[in-house]
Amino acid sequence: SIPWNLERIIPAWHQTEEDRSPDGSSQVEVYLLDTSIQGAHREIEGRVTITDFNSVPEEDGTRFHRQASKCDSHGTHLAGVVSGRDAGVAKGTSLHSLRVLNCQGKGTVSGTLIGLEFIRKSQLIQPSGPLVVLLPLAGGYSRILNAACRHLARTGVVLVAAAGNFRDDACLYSPASAPEVITVGATNAQDQPVTLGTLGTNFGRCVDLFAPGKDIIGASSDCSTCFMSQSGTSQAAAHVAGIVARMLSREPTLTLAELRQRLIHFSTKDVINMAWFPEDQQVLTPNLVATLPPSTHETGGQLLCRTVWSAHSGPTRTATATARCAPEEELLSCSSFSRSGRRRGDWIEAIGGQQVCKALNAFGGEGVYAVARCCLVPRANCSIHNTPAARAGLETHVHCHQKDHVLTGCSFHWEVEDLSVRRQPALRSRRQPGQCVGHQAASVYASCCHAPGLECKIKEHGISGPSEQVTVACEAGWTLTGCNVLPGASLTLGAYSVDNLCVARVHDTARADRTSGEATVAAAICCRSRPSAKASWVQ
Amino acid sequence: QDEDGDYEELMLALPSQEDGLADEAAHVATATFRRCSKEAWRLPGTYIVVLMEETQRLQIEQTAHRLQTRAARRGYVIKVLHIFYDLFPGFLVKMSSDLLGLALKLPHVEYIEEDSFVFAQ
């Protein structure tokens, strides 16, 4: 029978098929930066190249005895999970191992950097097919390790990293916190977050998705035919590295941005019990379990988007938060969220030639998040139109005035600090199609895009009664690009996108004193891409 | 994901009063020193000196050599363990933490990060 982890990530229609590149040869290469490995193990024999790379610190303790099977344990298991004959995700994939972890599973940032540089040098000396780098390790946040990952990713290498086993925010660890890395948390056979003793999988906005990481059967270094079970975010990352290898095997030209978007889009949604995570991390943590996506030929033309959360701004009066998309992605909308509701809104601005999503804290606020909606829109041409705040009592309107440009998102930023005097912004699909409308003291920003066959529409849902949140979803075939809250009550916490669902959050106290006439509205902008059609606004 | 995580960044910008050595002119360091927020994971004595992105190959070597020379002048022995050319410009150095102020004032230095442990997950 198929082990639970493989059954979980590989849909039934994929189980038997072999992933081959168009010319029939599987040319994807996976580099594993880990402990030494047992290359003669039956699971991986013949498909593993043990490089001469070795950059590890000395083992601690005077009574430490090097035992080959112990030294090779972690790396051998992961090599098996990636490309093992029986228990591997990408069974035919060739793998190169670099030793950056010693027999106690310890390495250094510097050793890892030298390992990444070794891969870059190999790539320069002998260019090959697609490269996947698996980093089943974690240390404290390291600016240079993250920067090295960024540089390597920009050469076309796909890096997959363990989120970490510290039951903590993955953003506090590297390489997990590197935006250019696909960061993987661990789930068990019940699709729940993995607990490891008193700790467990890391979580938070730096995690891209989860994958099986508990009781994973794989190659054991105890003997050449032995198997054993291991757990951790390393195992989860190895699954995703295997999935990526299979995706690249079929379609070697897929970019990092496309791979990440497809992994997110085709993952299993909403099966993880978010209560396991700390309350303040639940909204930031993706409820996604990886599965092998179908090829683009079977699902072509789909508009793919993901939500990117910024770091928390901090509580100072003028604190700002910034969320960025990957270089290949388009920032289609920007919203903000504050647990206290004290925020001064959000806007899109260009920094160093890249559009970024910004959010501003308000006086007395505990801080804000900026929430970017990052999408893959082929041949897109996007721009921001903004109008300064109107005088008291007047509405501010912004629409996409360029021909064939459609509205993909709205942002509102208030000049005034006093939350009591301002009416919050509104988006109206019926009276003013394709317009962002802001009220008193709000600067309004419209994100307008032109792309072949891009069409968009607004979808609203309002609730008058007490409710902590209002949601509106885009229907099948449509993708959520923008999400805003149009409040009837005095205080809203903000809005954000969860997959194809727009979530508008309301403050508890606001909920209590709301009159039935004041509806809080979640307003979603839903778009789709029909390559044959012209860009249009759908009413 | 993050630009700057929860880890220590220390500004070491104390101008050094050198005894008439022209190449050690006291230009104030704008570079920063960074280290792991978890003390037990730190590896004091080993540092990754990261240079500005546009730094040329020869300049990397010159900077490492300059650090060695200036350190030697003060009686410190340092070992350049590795020079990074291909992913980012910089070098790995084994030296006393006493020399961080000196190193941060070298031309082309963007920041210095203390080495730290990583662990199998």
Partner: antibody, heavy 114, light 108 residues
Framework: QVQLVESGGGLVQPGGSLRLSCAAS????????MHWVRQAPGKGLEWVSN????????YYADSVKGRFTISRDNSKNTLYLQMNSLRAEDTAVYYC???????WGQGTLVTVSS | DIVLTQSPATLSLSPGERATLSCRAS???????LAWYQQKPGQAPRLLIY???SRATGVPARFSGSGSGTDFTLTISSLEPEDFAVYYC?????????FGQGTKVEIK
């Protein structure tokens, strides 16, 4: 200009103690490693001990380990060598030297004799 | 420990002659940390050469240093009367810091 002046030498009985000082001026004392080097009468130079600029790192020659202690007071620009359990073979002129041994003091004579 | 052996122990030369002093290490020495000193009776040593080949401030050009690994040389191209003294080589790249036993350059 750079100046190093040793003091504290003298005659001491075997087993006795002595504390040498080296007053530094003309440079940023705390930036530099400082060393003690000795020279027995008619003999060559022998390195004794050194200390890093911050005082956090110290090294000793095997011949003095456990008996001598090097220290510094950066606020006073002074280097010290505490010598305990002195032996006849410790008799020498003791020099302090800066950094890469580019400046030396004039030396102070320590005589260990009964 | 790195043992430095200087040869010859004594060098008898006349002013104007070339002096070649040798220093051999028991193991490879990082040349950045190889120095030569001059010492005259009743005086403290004076740094002549650091980094195996760089002249210290105020040292006349007739003094030059060379070598790497385990073999190092101090050359005085043309001896002046004030050059007659004892010369020491030293390595300070490894602890313990060690000196050679010295070469005495005397007037012939």
């Amino acid at each position: 200009q750079v100046q190093l002046v040793e003091s504290g030498g003298g005659l001491v009985q075997p087993g006795g103690s002595l504390r040498l000082s080296c007053a530094a001026s003309g440079f940023t004392f705390s930036d530099y490693y400082m060393h003690w080097v000795r020279q027995a009468p008619g003999k060559g130079l022998e390195w004794v001990s050194n200390i890093s600029g911050s005082g956090s790192t110290t090294y000793y020659a095997d011949s003095v380990k456990g008996r001598f202690t090097i220290s510094r007071d950066n606020s006073k620009n002074t280097l010290y060598l505490q010598m305990n359990s002195l032996r006849a073979e410790d008799t020498a002129v003791y020099y302090c030297a800066r950094g890469m041994f580019d400046f030396w003091g004039q030396g102070t004579l320590v005589t260990v004799s009964s | 420990d790195i043992v430095l052996t200087q040869s010859p122990a004594t060098l008898s030369l006349s002013p104007g002659e070339r002096a070649t002093l040798s220093c051999r290490a028991s193991q490879s020495v990082n040349s950045n940390y190889l120095a030569w000193y001059q010492q005259k009776p009743g005086q403290a040593p004076r740094l002549l050469i650091y980094g195996a080949s760089s002249r210290a401030t105020g040292v006349p050009a007739r003094f030059s240093g060379s070598g790497s690994g385990t073999d190092f040389t101090l050359t005085i191209s043309s001896l002046e009367p004030e050059d007659f003294a004892v010369y020491y080589c030293q390595q300070w790249g490894d602890v313990p810091i060690t000196f050679g036993q010295g070469t005495k350059v005397e007037i012939k």
